[in-house]
């Protein structure tokens, strides 16, 4: 499978909410011997590999924000902890997987990564990630609502496997 990032850039005004999205593409196994670990984190554009550094989003680590479930289950993060920070990550039956950030501030600007790990019981795993930029703007140049910029076809299948 691969991870697609439908949008590579989100430009939002301060105070707005935004939902960053990734999508699983390709065949997804749904047996008892496989589980999917999905999460979000902030990162930087590393010299060697984008998304290798896993920094917290509003003080919540990628482990706080993780979802895990079988192939076709929907899942949400634990509401209490995430919602206290204005965050919610969710996953549906169609491979879409998102994080919603409420009441954006300038400090939320940066590179965001979604990570999907397909974990099998016989000690194998397959990791893919997608990256997208969030720019939070203030003042007269800021848009009134979030503006999203589609990924190029090359970027939209932003794949890294381990």
């Amino acid at each position: 499978f691969k991870v697609a990032t439908p949008y590579s850039l989100y430009v939002c005004p301060e105070g707005q909410n935004v939902t960053l999205t990734c999508r699983l593409l390709g065949p997804v196994d749904k047996g008892h011997d496989v589980t999917f670990y999905k999460t979000w984190y902030r990162s930087s554009r590393g010299e060697v590999q984008t998304c290798s550094e896993r920094r917290p989003i509003r003080n919540l680590t990628f482990q706080d924000l993780h979802l895990h479930h079988g192939g076709h289950q929907a899942a949400n993060t634990s509401h209490d902890l995430a919602q206290r920070h204005g965050l919610e990550s969710a996953s549906d039956h169609h491979g879409n997987f998102s994080i919603t950030m409420r009441n954006l501030t300038l400090l939320d600007s940066g590179l965001y990564c979604c990570l999907v790990v397909e974990i099998r019981h016989h000690h194998s795993e397959h990791r893919v990630h997608g990256a997208m930029e969030l720019q939070v703007q203030t003042g007269k140049d800021a848009p009134s609502n979030c503006v999203v910029y589609p990924s190029s076809s090359q970027d939209s299948e932003n794949i890294t496997a381990a």
């Epitope: 011997d33 589980t35 590999q49 482990q63 990570l115 790990v117 019981h121 194998s124 990791r127």
Partner: antibody, heavy 120, light 107 residues
């Protein structure tokens, strides 16, 4: 904050078995791999095997296959490592440690270690 | 199995020195390389993951670099609490394997 608390030191006779426990608190237990790593006196770190509780089945280093059994009890958030047919070379500190993601990623939380002494 | 080779096996240094430890993998592991610090009688502690990312709470004098087969852990200015043994670990494939360790001693 995640904590892994291991059972106390053991002294065992050659040929016997030992079972070490590792109780996790402060985080999700079921979906994270727990590995067991041992360290003989003055030596380096050696991976023995691991388990992801939701799967129930464990994976073992070839060297320990057939002699080690790793299990997990989701109801008590506890992982166990049992080593049989003990010999003097098994004298070591045994650590449990949690992987941040999947089977092979970094070990971000460690237990305090359990010293197992094998002596006649 | 992927073999991990660290060098040197031990080194003597003074407080304030810049210290470099290297780790070589027997095959390419991309950036799936982690570094740990262990003090006598204590469990190892994660310092660096994914070759160059600093684990939360670890002082910025520690840094990591490299990809493929060759990796480096650098302590920019050695502090008294840094005298310990350092291990690399590959996280690219099963089974996970560690380097043999590098002991950093006081000169």
């Amino acid at each position: 904050q995640v904590q892994l608390v291991q059972s106390g030191a053991e002294v065992k006779k050659p040929g016997s078995s030992v079972k070490v426990s590792c109780k996790a608190s402060g985080g999700t237990f079921s979906s994270y791999a727990i590995s067991w790593v041992r360290q003989a006196p003055g030596q380096g770190l050696e991976w023995m095997g691991g388990i992801i509780p939701i799967f129930g089945t464990a994976n073992y280093a070839q060297k320990f296959q057939g002699r080690v059994t790793i299990t997990a009890d989701e109801s008590t958030s506890t992982a166990y490592m049992e080593l049989s047919s003990l010999r003097s070379e098994d004298t070591a500190v045994y650590y449990c440690a949690r992987h941040s993601i999947g089977w092979v990623a970094e070990l971000d939380y460690w237990g305090q270690g359990t010293l197992v002494t094998v002596s006649s | 199995d992927i073999q991990m080779t660290q060098s040197p096996s031990s080194l003597s240094a003074s407080v304030g020195d810049r210290v470099t430890i290297t780790c070589r993998a027997s095959q390419s592991i991309n950036t799936d390389l982690n570094w740990y610090q262990q003090k006598p009688g204590k469990a190892p502690k994660l310092l660096i993951y994914a070759a160059s990312s600093l684990q939360s709470g670890v002082p910025s004098r520690f840094s990591g670099s490299g990809s493929g087969t060759d990796f480096t852990l650098t302590i920019s200015s050695l502090q008294p609490e840094d005298f310990a043994t350092y291990y690399c670990q590959q996280g690219a494939s099963d089974p996970i394997t560690f380097g043999q360790g590098t002991k950093v001693e006081i000169k």
